[in-house]
Interface confidence: low
Amino acid sequence: FERTRSLQDPCSNCPAGTFCDNNRNQICSPCPPNSFSSAGGQRTCDICRQCKGVFRTRKECSSTSNAECDCTPGFHCLGAGCSMCEQDCKQGQELTKKGCKDCCFGTFNDQKRGICRPWTNCSLDGKSVLVNGTKERDVVCGPSPADLSPGASSVTPPAPAREPGHSPQ
């Protein structure tokens, strides 16, 4: 099938960085400035992404690959291709429509991004709170009260915090 296609379709010979120009008898023409084709056999070149405003250029566009953006200082990327930039906040805060706000009591955020998450509920795992939570840190769970017999010295690792963005089920 591939062989037949290349015999019948001269466009299949056009490499990445070019396009098959129908206006010029299907010759392979280089992509115009600010455009690219990342695969061969393309009939058009794609427009390069422009990193404007809060976006800044991490990698320039070339004839064979799109530009890549990241975010200016004080902002961080969201999404797999950095399709969004969001303002950083401090630890212990989350970004709301009205800007950075402190985490409510009972929640924490240990990063400059993301949302405040509920403290781990140690009692769900039959454990007790060893270290209280703060706006910036989750609680640390320790052994259950029953395990705290004289001579017991081992401390159970803390139960994992819930995934970001979710209230307890």
């Epitope: 969201l78 999404g79 797999a80 291709g81 429509k97 963005g165 979710h166 209230s167």
Partner: antibody, heavy 119, light 107 residues
Framework: QVQLVQSGAEVKKPGASVKASCKAS????????IHWVRQAPGQGLEWMGR????????EYAQKFQGRVTMTRDTSTSTVYMELSSLRSEDTAVYYC????????????WGQGTSVTVSS | DIQMTQSPSSVSASVGDRVTITCKAS??????LSWYQQKPGKAPKLLIY???RKVDGVPSRFSGSGSGTDFTLTISSLQPEDFATYYC?????????FGGGTKLEIK
């Protein structure tokens, strides 16, 4: 560029299992979540669950609990979704989509894997 | 589970019209709501997240608003390429749930 390329269409008999794959390129899958969303013919979107490729941990919608398993192979940047005990209601297009570590930002999607369950 | 009720389920409009789609959550979801556009045979496309934040490249005619349980997607002046189905999604808690969809058709 960011791309999610999914495996091809499948036709299965009731009671069988299907395993769809989703190969990522253009980004590090360990920086994101991969979600699976399905859409029955002419119907709306239904979130099935997500996997954190960095840890392998996953969360599933209760509706699919016990029937769905999401796994990953970080060496090939591929995520898999296996659905067992198939029934005709599972006929749908299954999409993989990337999220973000702190948000359900399903901002890049695979082309979908069509699964038909028919006797 | 958090139910998302979207209305209307379909709407006919003309190019240049202003269109509003609403989504109501069965419980407050803070600002964890996004909107998707889907065209026939294609994967959905993220337009707006966290209620009102537009994805890079989404035209300014699209806007989102609301809080708590009631949310709105507005298209200020419909263009031919906007005719599609729109879905809201809550992502406060598992399982994430989509609204039933709103099919926007040409009048």
């Amino acid at each position: 560029q960011v791309q999610l390329v999914q495996s091809g269409a499948e036709v299965k008999k009731p009671g069988a299992s299907v395993k769809a794959s989703c190969k990522a390129s253009g980004f590090n899958i360990q920086d994101t979540y991969i979600h699976w969303v399905r859409q029955a013919p002419g119907q709306g979107l239904e979130w099935m669950g997500r996997i954190d490729p960095a840890s392998g941990n996953s969360e599933y919608a209760q509706k699919f609990q016990g029937r769905v398993t999401m796994t990953r192979d970080t060496s090939t940047s591929t995520v898999y979704m296996e659905l067992s005990s198939l029934r005709s209601e599972d006929t749908a297009v299954y999409y993989c989509t990337t999220g973000n570590l702190h948000y359900a930002l399903m901002d890049y999607w695979g082309q979908g894997t069509s699964v038909t369950v028919s006797s | 589970d958090i139910q998302m009720t979207q209305s209307p389920s379909s709407v006919s409009a003309s190019v240049g019209d202003r269109v509003t789609i609403t989504c109501k959550a069965s419980q407050p979801i803070n600002t964890y709501l996004s909107w998707y556009q889907q065209k026939p045979g294609k994967a959905p496309k993220l337009l707006i997240y966290r209620v009102n934040r537009k994805v890079d490249g989404v035209p300014s005619r699209f806007s989102g608003s609301g809080s708590g349980t009631d949310f709105t997607l507005t298209i200020s002046s419909l263009q031919p390429e906007d005719f599609a189905t729109y879905y809201c999604l809550q992502y406060l808690d598992f399982p994430y749930t989509f609204g039933g969809g709103t099919k926007l058709e040409i009048k």
